[in-house]
Amino acid sequence: FGISGKHFITVTTFTSAGNIGEDGTLSCTFEPDIKLNGIVIQWLKEGIKGLVHEFKEGKDDLSQQHEMFRGRTAVFADQVVVGNASLRLKNVQLTDAGTYTCYIRTSKGKGNANLEYKTGAFSMPEINV
């Protein structure tokens, strides 16, 4: 039998885009774990020292957060136990574009996945009937 925390768990991300100046979401899901206090979520960005966001023991820990993300991030805390590690990002900036890693550790094991986050001035296409 395996030892708790030594297994790999499935983490899934989706490439997404954010509108500059608006609020966005970086999507990440993982195998659910009812033990909230045992779940650690870390969001990292390639090329950035420090974390984008960290959630552990049932609450945020922003002590290692990089300055560029200060006051701009949140997880959906009430959805973590059902496997939602998605990150809300306030006031999307051009410099937010890049490769992010969603790292998860639970009592079942650990895993991570990357996503490409694109930023720009996107608009809904007009459809003329």
């Epitope: 608006e22 300055e67 006051g71 949140a74 809300r88 306030k90």
Partner: antibody
Framework: QLQLQESGPGLVKPSETLSLTCTVS??????????WGWIRQPPGKGLEWIGN???????YYNPSLRSRVTISVDTSKNQFSLKLSSVTAADTAVYYC????????????WGQGTLVTVSS | EIVMTQSPATLSVSPGERATLSCRAS??????LAWYQQKPGQAPRLLIY???TRATGIPARFSGSGSGTEFTLTISSLQSEDFAVYYC?????????FGGGTKVEIK
């Protein structure tokens, strides 16, 4: 429930440093989802955000005051403090401390406020 | 910095009537806006955040709406305890800024 209480001198001389402390009770200043902020309100006027601090010590200040402001935290006492140097009469205000959400960043709750008058 | 403008500066309303307060941002703040109530000699009290979410313990007669640059706080039926000054605040970008306030007074 969580309560905040400001304390410090009510009168400061021009060019000196204003020093205030906010004591948090009914909860821990180490609560991870919150910053701890200072806001001021000159008599009969509106509100101005001064800056905030996280329990780990990282700070962010209003650029208009950045050169004169220092916010610090003492987790062992469950307190955070404000220092504003080189004060003038324009710094006369009611100073409030408040808990600030990490995002959304609303202020709730607030301390009762303390009036600081800058006068010789 | 983002400038928040509130109107009117003073609103005279009779008890039981509806009050509509406006707040405009100099640039889009998405839904990153809060409303506060302040009575004389007291600290502000959070009413609304996220432009439309009522804070804990706030009566249903208070409602917020809007996004982008235009926001509204509505008090559906004014009670005696609602006469106060109301401030909007944006937290879309640093530095966080407040509007100049709207005083709701008894007509």
């Amino acid at each position: 429930q969580l309560q905040l209480q400001e304390s410090g001198p009510g009168l400061v001389k021009p060019s000196e440093t204003l020093s205030l402390t906010c004591t948090v009770s009914g909860g821990s200043i180490k609560s991870g989802s919150y910053y701890w902020g200072w806001i001021r309100q000159p008599p009969g006027k509106g509100l101005e955000w001064i800056g905030n601090i996280y329990y780990s010590g990282s700070t962010y200040y209003n650029p208009s005051l950045r050169s004169r402001v220092t916010i610090s935290v003492d987790t062992s006492k469950n307190q955070f403090s404000l220092k504003l140097s080189s004060v003038t009469a324009a710094d006369t205000a009611v100073y409030y401390c408040a808990r600030e959400g990490s995002y959304p960043n609303q202020f709730d709750p607030w301390g009762q406020g303390t009036l600081v008058t800058v006068s010789s | 910095e983002i400038v928040m403008t509130q109107s009117p500066a003073t609103l005279s309303v009779s008890p039981g009537e509806r009050a509509t307060l406006s707040c405009r941002a100099s640039q889009s703040v998405s839904s990153n806006l809060a409303w506060y109530q302040q009575k004389p000699g007291q600290a502000p009290r959070l009413l609304i955040y996220g432009a439309s979410t009522r804070a804990t313990g706030i009566p249903a007669r208070f409602s917020g709406s809007g996004s982008g640059t235009e926001f509204t706080l509505t008090i559906s039926s004014l009670q005696s305890e609602d006469f106060a000054v109301y401030y909007c605040q944006q937290y879309h970008s640093f530095p966080f800024t407040f509007g100049g306030g709207t005083k709701v007074e008894i007509k």
